[in-house]
C-alpha cells in the first residue's frame, strides 16, 4: 500500500493569511491568522464592513489592509490613544495668534478668523480690514463708508429721501397739496430778497403830476410798495407800509416830510390805494376814502425841457437812497398789487412784461404765515447766550407748522466748521400717512416724536427748550429718546458748538456734507418760528432764498373731509 503524501507539502494555504497547516487523510486544514478567512486563508476579512462592529469601531475613517485594518482621521482631527476616536484639533488654542487681531473660531476640523460685521479678514496682514461697502455700489445715490459699516444718503436738496431699505432713494412726496395757482395780473412784490421787482421810467408832458393807483394785498407789516424819483435824484417819494399802515416819505427842494396814517391794511385783503399829487398837497386814499393829505409848497418833481421825467421802482429803491430816507425802513415786502395805474397811463406795457415772468406772478389765494417751497433756506444770526442765565446759552423754540411734504429740515444750527450741532426735522414715518419729528445733534437722533398727522389743514404747534444740561419738550407728546448718558454726551457736543459761532437756518441746511445730519431735505410747507421769545421775521434774515415767502402762505388745494385732515389735538396751536 502506498503512503498518502503530506497534504501540507507543498503548502496549500495562502502564505500571508495562514497561521498553520494540519495534514489529514488525503486532506489539509489551514488555520487562519486573525483578519483572514477561506479554506486556504486566501480571503482578507474586511473589518471595516463588519456589521457587528460598524466601521471597525473607527469614529471617522476605517482603512482595511490585507489581514488587518486601522482607523485614521480627517484633516483637522487627531487620533486619541485608543486608536479609534478622532478628536477635533482646536487650532485656536494650539496657535493663539493664528488669526492676528481677528477672533479665532474653532470649527470641527478647521478654524475661522472672524471679524466684526463690516470687516473682512486679510490673510496676509492677519487682521480685520474695513469693508468698503461703497465700492460695492450699495447705495443708490451717496455712500459714506466708515470703519465697520456704511450709510447711504440721498440728495434731499434735490427732493430725495432714503427709502425703507436704507439703500435706495425715493422722491419726497407731497402730503398736503397746496393751491399754487398764480395770475399774471397780480404783481408779486417779494420776487427778490434784495432788489427791485419792477423799474419804470416815464417821460410825460410837464403839466403831468405824480399819481399812482393800485389794489394792494399783504400780511406783511413793513416794506416798500413803491418809490418814485426825479431823473436827477433831487426829489423823491416813498410809499411804504410800517406797522401795517401806509407811510409816505417825500423830499424835494422845498420840503422833507414823513406821514403815516389810515387803518391797518396788512389784513390779507385787497385794499384800493391811491396816491395823487394835487396842486398844493398829496392825497392818499384807501378804498377811495382820504386818509392823509400832505401839504407841499410846489410841484413834487420839477419838469425840465418841457418834460416831466420820473423813475418808479416797485418793492424797493436804489441802494444809495437808503441813507437819504427820513426814517430808515426795511424795504422787503411780501405782498401783491393789481389793477395799477401809474401817472394815469393805465397798465399798458407793464402787464406784457409781467406776463412773461412766472416768478413775478402772485398767488391767487394766500393765508397768514411764512411759506418754504422746499428749494431754499433763510439764515439768521441769533445770540443764544443769556448773561443773566446761569445755564449760559439756551434755545427756546416754538414752531407752528403746516407741512405739505413729510420730510425736511425745519430748523438747524450750523457751526463754522460745517457741522450741524442741532437740528429739528420732519421725516415721513414708517406708519402710513404720518410724520415723525426728529431732533438731532450732528448725525445722531436724540429725540423722535413718532407718528404724528402733521399734513393737515390745521397747524401743529411744537415747543421745546434746550440748554447744556437738558432738552425739554413742552408739547405733551410721546417721545422716543436715547439713554440719559448718551443724551448728556450729545448735549456736550452741542454745548461745545454753542460756545463758538453758530448760524441759524430755517427751512433746510446750507452746503454741509450729506452725512452731517440724519435729514438733509429742504422743508416744504408753512412755518412760523419763535426763538427765545422773538417771532422771526424772514424780512430780517441775513439771507433768504427768493422762493421763500416771508408773510404769505398758499392755501390748501382743496378741503377734504376724510380723517387725513385730523391733526393730533395736542399739537393744535391754542393762540
Amino acid at each position: 500500500v502506498n503512503a498518502i503524501p503530506d497534504q501540507c507539502s507543498p503548502l496549500p494555504c495562502n502564505e500571508d493569511g495562514y497561521m498553520s497547516c494540519k495534514d489529514g487523510k488525503a486532506s489539509f486544514t489551514c488555520t487562519c491568522k486573525p483578519g483572514w478567512q477561506g479554506e486556504k486563508c486566501e480571503f482578507d476579512i474586511n473589518e471595516c464592513k463588519d456589521p457587528s462592529n460598524i466601521n471597525g469601531g473607527c469614529s471617522q475613517i476605517c482603512d482595511n489592509t490585507p489581514g488587518s485594518y486601522h482607523c485614521s482621521c480627517k484633516s483637522g482631527f487627531v487620533m486619541l490613544s485608543n486608536k479609534k476616536d478622532c478628536k477635533d484639533v482646536d487650532e485656536c488654542s494650539l496657535k493663539p495668534n493664528m488669526c492676528g487681531t481677528a477672533v479665532c473660531k474653532n470649527i470641527p476640523g478647521d478654524f475661522e478668523c472672524e471679524c466684526p460685521e463690516g470687516y473682512r479678514y486679510n490673510l496676509k496682514s492677519k487682521s480685520c480690514e474695513d469693508v468698503d461697502e461703497c465700492s460695492e455700489n450699495m447705495c443708490a445715490q451717496l455712500c459714506v463708508n466708515y470703519p465697520g459699516g456704511y450709510t447711504c444718503y440721498c440728495d434731499g436738496k434735490k427732493g430725495f429721501k432714503l427709502a425703507q431699505d436704507q439703500k435706495s432713494c425715493e422722491a419726497v412726496s407731497v402730503c398736503l397739496p397746496l393751491n399754487l395757482d398764480t395770475k399774471y395780473e397780480l404783481l408779486y412784490l417779494a420776487e427778490q430778497f434784495a432788489g427791485v421787482v419792477l423799474y419804470l421810467k416815464f417821460r410825460l408832458p410837464e403839466i403831468s403830476r405824480f399819481s399812482a393807483e393800485f389794489d394792494f394785498r399783504t400780511y406783511d407789516s413793513q416794506g416798500v410798495i413803491l418809490y418814485a424819483e426825479s431823473i436827477d435824484h433831487s426829489a423823491w417819494l416813498l410809499i411804504a407800509l410800517r406797522g401795517g399802515k401806509i407811510e409816505v416819505q417825500l423830499k424835494n427842494e422845498h420840503t422833507s416830510k414823513i406821514t403815516t396814517g389810515g387803518d391797518i391794511i396788512n389784513n390779507g385783503l385787497w385794499n384800493m390805494v391811491s396816491v395823487e399829487e394835487l396842486e398844493h398837497s398829496i392825497s392818499i386814499k384807501i378804498a377811495k376814502e382820504a386818509v392823509m393829505d400832505i401839504n407841499k409848497p410846489g410841484p413834487l418833481f420839477k419838469p425840465e425841457n418841457g418834460l416831466l421825467e420820473t423813475k418808479v421802482y416797485f418793492a424797493g429803491f436804489p441802494r444809495k437812497v437808503e441813507s437819504e430816507l427820513i426814517k430808515p425802513i426795511n424795504p422787503r415786502l411780501d405782498g401783491c398789487i393789481r389793477s395799477w395805474n401809474l401817472m394815469k397811463q393805465g397798465a399798458s406795457g407793464i402787464k406784457e412784461i409781467i406776463q412773461e415772468k412766472q416768478n413775478k406772478h402772485c398767488l391767487v389765494t394766500v393765508e397768514k404765515g411764512s411759506y418754504y417751497p422746499g428749494s431754499g433756506i433763510a439764515e439768521f444770526h441769533i445770540d443764544y447766550n443769556n448773561g443773566s442765565n446761569a445755564e449760559g446759552w439756551h434755545i427756546n423754540v416754538t414752531l407752528n407748522i403746516r407741512p405739505s411734504m413729510g420730510t425736511g429740515v425745519m430748523l438747524a444750527l450750523v457751526s463754522s466748521n460745517n457741522t450741524v450741532p442741532f437740528a429739528v426735522s420732519l421725516v415721513d414715518s414708517t406708519s402710513e400717512k404720518s410724520q415723525d419729528i426728529v431732533i438731532s445733534v450732528e448725525n445722531t437722533v436724540i429725540y423722535r416724536i413718532q407718528a404724528l398727522s402733521l399734513c393737515s389743514n390745521q397747524r401743529s404747534h411744537l415747543e421745546f427748550r434746550v440748554n447744556r444740561n437738558n432738552l425739554e419738550l413742552l408739547t405733551p407728546l410721546k417721545i422716543e429718546t436715547i439713554s440719559q448718558e448718551e443724551l448728556q454726551t450729545q448735549l456736550a457736543i452741542l454745548d461745545k458748538a454753542m460756545k463758538g459761532k453758530v448760524a441759524t437756518y430755517l427751512g433746510g441746511l446750507p452746503d454741509v456734507p450729506f452725512s452731517a445730519t440724519p435729514v438733509n431735505a429742504f422743508y416744504n410747507g408753512c412755518m412760523e418760528v419763535n426763538i427765545n421769545g422773538v417771532e422771526l421775521d424772514l424780512d430780517e434774515a441775513i439771507s433768504k432764498h427768493n422762493d421763500i415767502r416771508a408773510h404769505s402762505c398758499p392755501s390748501v388745494w382743496k378741503k377734504t373731509k376724510n380723517s387725513e385732515d385730523q391733526v393730533d389735538p395736542r399739537l393744535i396751536d391754542g393762540k
Epitope: V78, M79, L80, S81, K87, D88, V89, D90, C92, S93, L94, P96, K105, N106, P108
Partner: antibody
Framework: EVKLEESGGGLVQPGGSMKLSCAAS????????MDWVRQSPEKGLEWVAE??????????YYAESVKGRFTISRDDSKSGVYLQMNSLRPEDTGIYYC??????????WGQGTTLTVSS | QIALTQSPAIMSASPGEKVTMTCSVS?????MHWYQQKPGSSPRLWIY???NLVSGVPGRFSGSGSGTSYSLTLSSMEAEDAATYYC?????????FGGGTKLEIK
C-alpha cells in the same frame, strides 16, 4: 497598548523637595504632549503642568498655584516625563497622575502616585 | 481663569431612570470634555468635544451644550454607571476641571 507608570511619591516635609517620574510606552512618546494632574479631597482634580512635544519646542505651562516652584521636564530617549517639586506646601498633597494629552484633553491616565506634604 | 461649576454635587438614580448633570462655565468656551472616575481608579476620558462618546462608552450616554452651559445625560441608569463625573475645558494655556458630580445608584 498605552501605558503610563508614575513613581517617586511619598511623604515630605513642608518646604521640602520631591521629584516624580512617569515612564511611558505604547505610543510615539516624542510626538506626545504630557501633563501632570493632581487630585485631593479638598480641591478635586487640578491640572498642574504640561510639556509639549519637540515640534512645539518642548514648551512648558504651569498652573498659577505651582508656578516658580514646580518644573516639568522630559527625556524623549527614555520616554520619561518628570516633575521636580520644590518649596512644597501641605496643599500640594494629593495623588499625582501622569497623562497623555491629545488636543487639550487628558486622553490617557496613569494609576497615580501619592504625595503627602506634612510635618 | 475660567471656572467650571458642576451640579448637583451628589445625586442618586434608580435603574432605568434618566439622569442629567450640568457644568456651568464662567465665560464662553468652544468645547467641553467629560471624565468618569470610579473609586480606587484613575479618571477615564468619557465624552470629548462636548458630544462625542469615546469608543466603548455605552450609547445611553450623551453630551450637549455650548457657550457657558454644558450637560451630560444618561438616558437609562445602570449599576455600572455609578461613578463621579468631571467636566474639563482648556482656555488660554490653562486647564480647569469642575468639582465633579457623584452619581449613586438607588
Amino acid at each position: 497598548e498605552v501605558k503610563l507608570e508614575e513613581s517617586g511619591g511619598g511623604l515630605v516635609q513642608p518646604g521640602g523637595s520631591m521629584k516624580l517620574s512617569c515612564a511611558a510606552s505604547g505610543f510615539t512618546f516624542s510626538d506626545a504632549w504630557m501633563d501632570w494632574v493632581r487630585q485631593s479631597p479638598e480641591k478635586g482634580l487640578e491640572w498642574v503642568a504640561e510639556i509639549r512635544s519637540k515640534a512645539n519646542n518642548h514648551a512648558t505651562y504651569y498652573a498659577e498655584s505651582v508656578k516658580g516652584r514646580f518644573t516639568i521636564s522630559r527625556d524623549d530617549s527614555k520616554s520619561g516625563v518628570y516633575l521636580q517639586m520644590n518649596s512644597l506646601r501641605p496643599e500640594d498633597t494629593g495623588i499625582y497622575y501622569c497623562t497623555l494629552t491629545t488636543a487639550f484633553l487628558f486622553d490617557y491616565w496613569g494609576q497615580g502616585t501619592t504625595l503627602t506634604v506634612s510635618s | 481663569q475660567i471656572a467650571l461649576t458642576q451640579s448637583p454635587a451628589i445625586m442618586s438614580a434608580s435603574p432605568g431612570e434618566k439622569v442629567t448633570m450640568t457644568c456651568s462655565v464662567s465665560s464662553s468656551v468652544s468645547y467641553m470634555h467629560w471624565y468618569q472616575q470610579k473609586p480606587g481608579s484613575s479618571p477615564r476620558l468619557w465624552i470629548y468635544d462636548t458630544s462625542n462618546l469615546v469608543s466603548g462608552v455605552p450609547g445611553r450616554f450623551s453630551g450637549s451644550g455650548s457657550g457657558t452651559s454644558y450637560s451630560l445625560t444618561l438616558s437609562s441608569m445602570e449599576a455600572e454607571d455609578a461613578a463621579t463625573y468631571y467636566c474639563q475645558q482648556y482656555s488660554g494655556y490653562l486647564y480647569t476641571f469642575g468639582g465633579g458630580t457623584k452619581l449613586e445608584i438607588k
